[in-house]
Amino acid sequence: SRGSCDSLCNCEEKDGTMLINCEAKGIKMVSEISVPPSRPFQLSLLNNGLTMLHTNDFSGLTNAISIHLGFNNIADIEIGAFNGLGLLKQLHINHNSLEILKEDTFHGLENLEFLQADNNFITVIEPSAFSKLNRLKVLILNDNAIESLPPNIFRFVPLTHLDLRGNQLQTLPYVGFLEHIGRILDLQLEDNKWACNCDLLQLKTWLENMPPQSIIGDVVCNSPPFFKGSILSRLKKESICPTPPVYEEHEDPSGSLHLAATSSINDSRMSTKTTSILKLPTKAPGLIPYITKPSTQLPGPYCPIPCNCKVLSPSGLLIHCQERNIESLSDLRPPPQNPRKLILAGNIIHSLMKSDLVEYFTLEMLHLGNNRIEVLEEGSFMNLTRLQKLYLNGNHLTKLSKGMFLGLHNLEYLYLEYNAIKEILPGTFNPMPKLKVLYLNNNLLQVLPPHIFSGVPLTKVNLKTNQFTHLPVSNILDDLDLLTQIDLEDNPWDCSCDLVGLQQWIQKLSKNTVTDDILCTSPGHLDKKELKALNSEILCPGLVNNPSMPTQTSYLMVTTPATTTNTADTILRSLTDAVPLS
C-alpha cells in the first residue's frame, strides 16, 4: 500500500494521537491507505478523488477517532462502508456529492459525536438514518436540499447542535421532531422555505419557550406571499393561523407541552464543549444572526470591541461577544457602561483574574461557557454582587473552592457542567446563599465533602454523568431540604451496602424529583439494574431493614474501575482540539 506514513501521507504525533494527513494526494480508493496499527489517529483525506465508499472500506482503520472526507466527490456510501469504526468520534463528509442518507449509511459509528455533512446535495434522509448514533451531539446539514425530515429522525439522538440552514424545509412539527431535540443549544434554521401557516405554530411556540441562552437562528417566512421575508418570531400567532385548529392534547401548541422538551434538568443547556468548533464553514459561518441584528445598535464608544450590544429596557446593556476569539476579558475595550448581560461563550479565555470583572458590578448574567478556563483566581467575581446567573460550563476547571465564588450573594443559577471537575472543597457553595439551581453533570466527581449543600437553598441539582459509586445521605443529600429535582443517572453506582441509604432517600422523595433511573454498574450481577427496584436485602445481604440506619458520612476518596469511561473527559479530549475548518 502506498498510503502509509513513510510514503504517500504526512504523519505527526500530537498528545498520543497520530495525525495522518493524506490531503490532495489523488487518492481514488480508501484501500490505498494503510495506517500504523494499535494507536488512535485522525485521518484527513480532504480533496482527493474519492467517488464512492465501499463496504468495509474502513475496516482496517479501527483506531480512527476522526476522519475528514471533505471536498471529495463521494456520491454514494455502500451499506457497511463504516464497519470497524466503532471508536470514531468525528466524521466530516462535507462538500461532497451525496444525495441521500440511507438507513444504514452510518452503520458502525456507534460512538460518533460529530457529523458534518454540509454542502452536499442531500434531498432525502431515510427514517432510521441516525437511529444508531446514540452519542451524536453535533449534526451539520446546512446547504443541502432537504425538503422534509422523517418523523422521529432524532428520537434516540442527543443532539445539542443542529444546523439546517440553506435547505428546502417548510415546517418542523412538534410530534416526531421538536419533542426529540430537547437538549438543543444551537439550532440554525435560516434560509429554508418556511411556510408560515398553522402548521408552523408549533415551531413558533417551541422557539418561544427556548431558554434565552440557546442560540436559535431566525426563521424567515417564504410563504404565503404576504408573509414572505417576515421573521416568524415577530408575527402574531393569530395572523399566522387565524382560526386555530383543534389539537389533540399532546399536540397542544399553547406552550405548556414544550416544557418537557426544553426545561427539564437533564437537558444540560449550554453544556457541551462544541460551540467553538461550530466555526466551521457551514456556510463559512459568521456571526449568529440574532446577534448581528440587535434592535438598537449602539454607537462605538459604549460597546466594547469586538462585541455587539443591545439596550435592555429600562437601562443596561446586553453584550454579545460570542465566538470572537477573545483570550482575556481585558480584550474588551472600552469597558461597557452599565452592563446587564455579558455573553462570552465560545471564546478562548484560559483564565479569569481578580481584576478582569471589577468594572462589571452591574451584571446580572455572565456567560463564560465553552471557553478554556483552567484558572479562576480567588475573588474573580467579588464585585458581581448582582449576578443571578453564571455559566462556566464547557471549560477546563478541575477543582472548585469557596474563594472562586466570593461575592456572588445573589447568584441563583450556576452552570458548571462539562468541565473536568474532580474535587469540590468544603464550603465551596457557602458564598451563594441564594443558589437554587446547580449543574455539575458531566464532570469527574467521585465524592462530595460533608455539608457541601448546607445552608444552600438548592431546588435543582444535576450530578449526572460523573464518577460516583455511592453518595452519602447524612450530611450531604439530607441537606437538600428544598429539592424539587435531582439527576443522578449515568454514574458507576456500586449497588452494595453503601447505597442502601441513597436508595431509601430516593424512595422518600416525591415521584418526579429524581428525573431518571439510577442504574447499577457493579457488582456485575446487578449491572444495569434499577436501584429503586432492588430489594435492600439484595443490595446488602443480611441487612436488617432499619430506616434509621446510619449511612456513610466519611469524606473518602472512592476509587472507581479504570474501565469506567467518562463522557466529559472523552468529549473534552475529542472536541477541544482544532477541528479542520473545511
Epitope: F71, E99, D143, G166, D191, L280, P281, A284, P285, G286
Partner: antibody, heavy 120, light 107 residues
Framework: QVQLVQSGAEVKKPGASVKVSCTAS????????LHWVRQAPGQGLEWVGI????????VYAQKFQGRVTMTRDTSTNTVYMELSSLRSEDTAVYYC?????????????WGQGTLVTVSA | EIVLTQSPATLSLSPGERATLSCRAS??????LAWYQQKPGQTPRLLIY???NRATGVPARFSGSGSGTDFTLTISSLETEDFAVYYC?????????FGGGTKVEIK
C-alpha cells in the same frame, strides 16, 4: 455594496512566483468562501481553488497542487493566491470570486481581475 | 474531472432573434449546471444556476433547461447588450469546471 478589489498587474519571469491579493468589502468576510479562477488570453475560465476565510485548509485543483498557496488575513479582509514555478502558460487574468451564500460552488461577485504575464 | 463541451463555438445572430446554446457534460451533473455571461473587458456574471433558476436581476428572456448531461441556455429575443461569451459551469464535482464558451456575436 459588495466589492472585491484585486492587486495590480504583474510581470514575472519563468520560474518566479507571484502573489495576488483580493480585498473584500461590503459584507461579512467570514461568511463567504472565496475562489480563484483564471482566464488565459482569449481562452475560457479555469478554477484554481477555494478558501474559507474563517479558517481551514484551502482546496486546490489537482492541476495546481504543489504550486499554489491560498492564504487569508481576516484583519484586512484579504485573501491571497500565490503561484510559484511560473511558466509561460500561467499567463492569464486571475480573478477572485465569492461563493454564493447558499451555493458555495457558484460565483456571485468577481474581482476586477489581475493580469499576470510570465515572460522571459 | 467533468469535461463540459459547449456548442457552437460561435453563434452569429441579429438582435431580436432567438439564441440557443448547448452544453454537454462528460458525465451526469444532475441539474447542477450554471451559465455565466462575460462581455469583453468585463468579469463574468452569473445568469442561471441549477439548470433553470435565474439569478437575481437577470431578465426573463434568459432561460435554462436540461438535466443529466445535456443542457441548453435560451435567449428568447436577443438585445444588443446580450452579445457576449457564455460559459457553462458544473458544481457537482471538484474541481469545478467550465465549458470552453460560446461567443454570441452580431450577424
Amino acid at each position: 455594496q459588495v466589492q472585491l478589489v484585486q492587486s495590480g498587474a504583474e510581470v514575472k519571469k519563468p520560474g518566479a512566483s507571484v502573489k495576488v491579493s483580493c480585498t473584500a468589502s461590503g459584507y461579512i468576510f467570514n461568511d463567504y468562501y472565496l475562489h480563484w479562477v483564471r482566464q488565459a488570453p482569449g481562452q475560457g475560465l479555469e478554477w484554481v481553488g477555494i478558501i474559507n476565510p474563517s479558517g481551514g485548509s484551502p482546496v486546490y485543483a489537482q492541476k495546481f497542487q504543489g504550486r499554489v498557496t491560498m492564504t487569508r488575513d481576516t484583519s484586512t479582509n484579504t485573501v491571497y493566491m500565490e503561484l510559484s514555478s511560473l511558466r509561460s502558460e500561467d499567463t492569464a487574468v486571475y480573478y477572485c470570486a465569492r461563493g454564493m451564500v447558499r451555493g458555495v460552488r457558484l460565483f456571485d461577485y468577481w474581482g476586477q481581475g489581475t493580469l499576470v504575464t510570465v515572460s522571459a | 474531472e467533468i469535461v463540459l463541451t459547449q456548442s457552437p463555438a460561435t453563434l452569429s445572430l441579429s438582435p431580436g432573434e432567438r439564441a440557443t446554446l448547448s452544453c454537454r457534460a462528460s458525465q451526469s451533473v444532475s441539474s447542477y449546471l450554471a451559465w455565466y455571461q462575460q462581455k469583453p473587458g468585463q468579469t463574468p456574471r452569473l445568469l442561471i444556476y441549477d439548470a433553470s433558476n435565474r439569478a437575481t436581476g437577470v431578465p426573463a428572456r434568459f432561460s435554462g433547461s436540461g438535466s443529466g448531461t445535456d443542457f441548453t441556455l435560451t435567449i428568447s429575443s436577443l438585445e444588443t447588450e446580450d452579445f457576449a461569451v457564455y460559459y457553462c459551469q458544473q458544481r457537482t464535482n471538484w474541481p469545478l469546471t467550465f465549458g470552453g464558451g460560446t461567443k454570441v456575436e452580431i450577424k
